[in-house]
Interface confidence: low
């Protein structure tokens, strides 16, 4: 449906609060480095002429394209080239490169101070002065660290932000009400960021056909009731939606959001028996509900799947027939049937079926070569099974922490050559893995603890890419989308690697670790380890368990000495000359 | 894209007879089984009747046995509902589904039974 101006129609469908909001988003998603204040400016000059158009459609400029308008209006900012080097150079290029060219410039580590958190007292009194800047400020920061962060998405964290401060700002012991909120909405909003930069990674490293497929697998396991053609509608707007996410396209993303959930509540019937609660929430809390509802019961007659996809004589007609298609129904059939199974283990399956009958379709007897295919299932199926059910138990003796470890060190000896950061910020995400799947049942260990694992390892991925050290990341992050996780674990020991040089400074602490947070300690310590690996590859478990050990009793005792700093320093040198001689340094 | 077009709907007088047709595409029809699921006015998805994908199987929900008749033209791609001695409450919009699960994936058309 084509509108005279697109300003105008987007503005009328999402109200000015949602507009002003989504646009702040995108202007931060693409120029991390600007000020808040500059920004600000910014939306409120694009929000004025939206209303100018929403008065008369017909007025200058307003039949521009959304990108042409934002684009020209980014292309404003005096500071670009000395803030920004060459993504100023996207401004001399025309719609639609132009805006290419800005998602290309995106930075999923951009070099931001972390966000510190003030006391509840400063915090409260900001939220009272001025709600609405808070607010926006909220949006601003979250926006700028995580540049492909669900926008529709951050507008519910926002309205769950606003509550949680307008509830706490009045109750009696604030920072016992407020700050576990904020701990929640922090950690949720880092899962959620993460899970996002997947579905784009998908859509833009692997295309429209990958993303659809996760999502034919992920829509089936949820509605399981759903007919076929049901399922293809929602993946067909499902995808429309995360494309224009991911493609900086944030009204449109929204608008067609809540296009999709409203249809979803008006047709529940035929999609899911457990839609209901949540099409009785307002829109946000509505879309968020949709999107993390449990899978629906399986119906309970479903015919075995052989008749349709191997017993069958006309196999090879249909699938020779549409291709897609027939691929689509029978991931649609295996997804509904398995939701105990992980959506890239499904995906697995489908890329081995897909591959059987392209070699077999072309064979003298089809029906002989492909009757077997189910066969070729059960080592795919296996291998997870088995990894989950060694990891889980290695879990349950060691405790998080000291999973993370172990994960720290398997990692770091396949892949030296990453950063020790980026080493250690993807260790100790594989490492809660345990503690957030291993408490579920056997049915549902596998799609929460790989499904987890595809969106923890496409950080790593997607940090890397930024600046490739390592032919062997490249090489299981590129080739496959659903083999990346069997892809790493297959890797042993680099043994090409060349140990690093011994720093004694890398190995020096100071007294400010003892005010640290428990969880800053614990990084302090796995950073170390993870040094200690680069140094010495081959170390043996137990040689690293030791000078871990004797670290930690040197934080102890140093953290409780009257002179810290001097204990630090002291015993510092004697630690890091006992941890030479353990290791053989 | 999957498309599941239904027609054949109308007024009709109880005891009188009607055909419904489902035109699909997008798909490899002759390839799957298909259903009729109706839907009366303010409740769930009903299952009528399922079809095998060569034609030889059919299935009737009690309420219909006797009275309705699936087919299916694979050569056409269509799938087909004939309904007799209809009764005011086989009032409901009736949808064709691929497979055998009561719901419904496309937009239906509406049998109304009533003197």
């Known amino acids: 449906d084509a509108h005279k101006s697109e300003v105008a129609h987007r503005f009328k469908d999402l109200g000015e609060e949602n507009f002003k909001a989504l646009v702040l988003i995108a202007f931060a998603q693409y120029l991390q480095q600007c000020p808040f204040e500059d920004h600000v400016k910014l939306v409120n000059e694009v929000t004025e002429f939206a209303k100018t158009c929403v008065a008369d459609e017909s007025a200058e400029n307003c039949d521009k394209s959304l990108h042409t308008l934002f684009g020209d209006k980014l292309c404003t900012v005096a500071t670009l080239r000395e803030t920004y080097g060459e993504m100023a150079d996207c401004c001399a290029k025309q719609e639609p490169e132009r805006n290419e060219c800005f998602l290309q410039h995106k930075d999923d580590n951009p070099n931001l101070p972390r966000l510190v958190r003030p006391e509840v007292d400063v915090m409260c009194t900001a939220f009272h002065d001025n709600e609405e800047t808070f607010l926006k400020k909220y949006l601003y920061e979250i926006a700028r660290r995580h540049p492909y962060f669900y926008a529709p998405e951050l507008l519910f964290f926002a309205k769950r932000y606003k509550a949680a401060f307008t509830e706490c700002c009045q109750a009696a012991d604030k920072a016992a009400c407020l700050l576990p909120k904020l701990d929640e909405l922090r950690d949720e909003g880092k899962a959620s960021s993460a899970k996002q930069r997947l579905k784009c990674a998908s859509l833009q490293k692997f295309g429209e056909r990958a993303f659809k497929a996760w999502a034919v697998a992920r829509l089936s396991q949820r509605f399981p009731k759903a007919e076929f053609a049901e399922v293809s509608k929602l993946v067909t707007d499902l995808t429309k939606v995360h494309t224009e996410c991911c493609h900086g396209d944030l009204l449109e993303c929204a608008d067609d959001r809540a296009d999709l959930a409203k249809y979803i509540c008006e047709n529940q019937d035929s999609i899911s028996s457990k839609l209901k609660e949540c099409c009785e929430k307002p829109l946000l809390e509505k879309s968020h509900c949709i999107a993390e509802v449990e899978n629906d019961e399986m119906p309970a007659d479903l015919p075995s799947l052989a008749a349709d996809f191997v017993e069958s004589k006309d196999v090879c007609k249909n699938y020779a027939e549409a291709k897609d298609v027939f691929l689509g129904m029978f991931l649609y059939e295996y997804a509904r049937r398995h939701p105990d199974y992980s959506v890239v283990l499904l995906l697995r399956l489908a890329k081995t079926y897909e591959t059987t009958l392209e070699k077999c379709c072309a064979a003298a007897d089809p029906h002989e070569c492909y009757a077997k295919v189910f066969d070729e299932f059960k080592p795919l199926v296996e291998e997870p099974q088995n990894l989950i059910k060694q990891n889980c138990e290695l879990f349950e003796q060691l405790g998080e922490y000291k999973f993370q470890n172990a994960l720290l060190v398997r990692y770091t000896k396949k892949v030296p050559q990453v950063s020790t950061p980026t080493l250690v910020e993807v260790s100790r995400n594989l490492g809660k893995v345990g503690s957030k799947c291993c408490k579920h049942p056997e049915a549902k260990r596998m799609p929460c603890a790989e499904d987890y694992l595809s969106v923890v390892l496409n950080q790593l991925c997607v940090l890397h890419e930024k600046t490739p050290v390592s032919d062997r990341v490249t090489k299981c992050c590129t080739e496959s989308l659903v083999n990346r996780r069997p892809c790493f674990s297959a890797l042993e020991v680099d043994e090409t690697y060349v140990p690093k040089e011994f720093n004694a400074e890398t190995f020096t602490f100071h007294a400010d670790i003892c005010t640290l947070s428990e969880k800053e300690r614990q990084i302090k310590k796995q950073t170390a380890l993870v040094e200690l690996v680069k140094h010495k590859p081959k170390a043996t478990k137990e040689q690293l368990k030791a000078v871990m050990d004797d670290f930690a009793a040197f934080v102890e005792k140093c953290c409780k000495a009257d002179d810290k700093e001097t204990c630090f320093a002291e015993e510092g040198k004697k630690l890091v000359a006992a941890s030479q001689a353990a290791l053989g340094l | 894209e999957v498309q599941l077009l239904e027609s054949g709907g109308g007024l009709v007088q109880p005891g009188g007879s009607l055909r419904l047709s489902c035109a699909a595409s997008g798909f490899t029809f002759s390839s799957f089984g298909m259903s009729w699921v109706r839907q009366a006015p303010g409740k769930g998805p009903e299952w009528v009747s399922a079809?095998?994908?060569?034609?030889?199987?059919?299935r009737y929900a009690e309420s219909v046995k006797g009275r309705f008749t699936i087919s299916r033209d694979n050569s056409k791609n269509t799938l087909y509902l004939q309904m007799n001695s209809l009764r005011p409450e086989d009032t409901a919009v009736y949808y064709c589904t691929i497979g055998r699960s009561a719901s419904r994936g496309s937009q239906g058309t509406l049998v109304t039974v009533s003197s």
């Open positions: 079809i095998d994908s060569g034609g030889a199987d059919t």
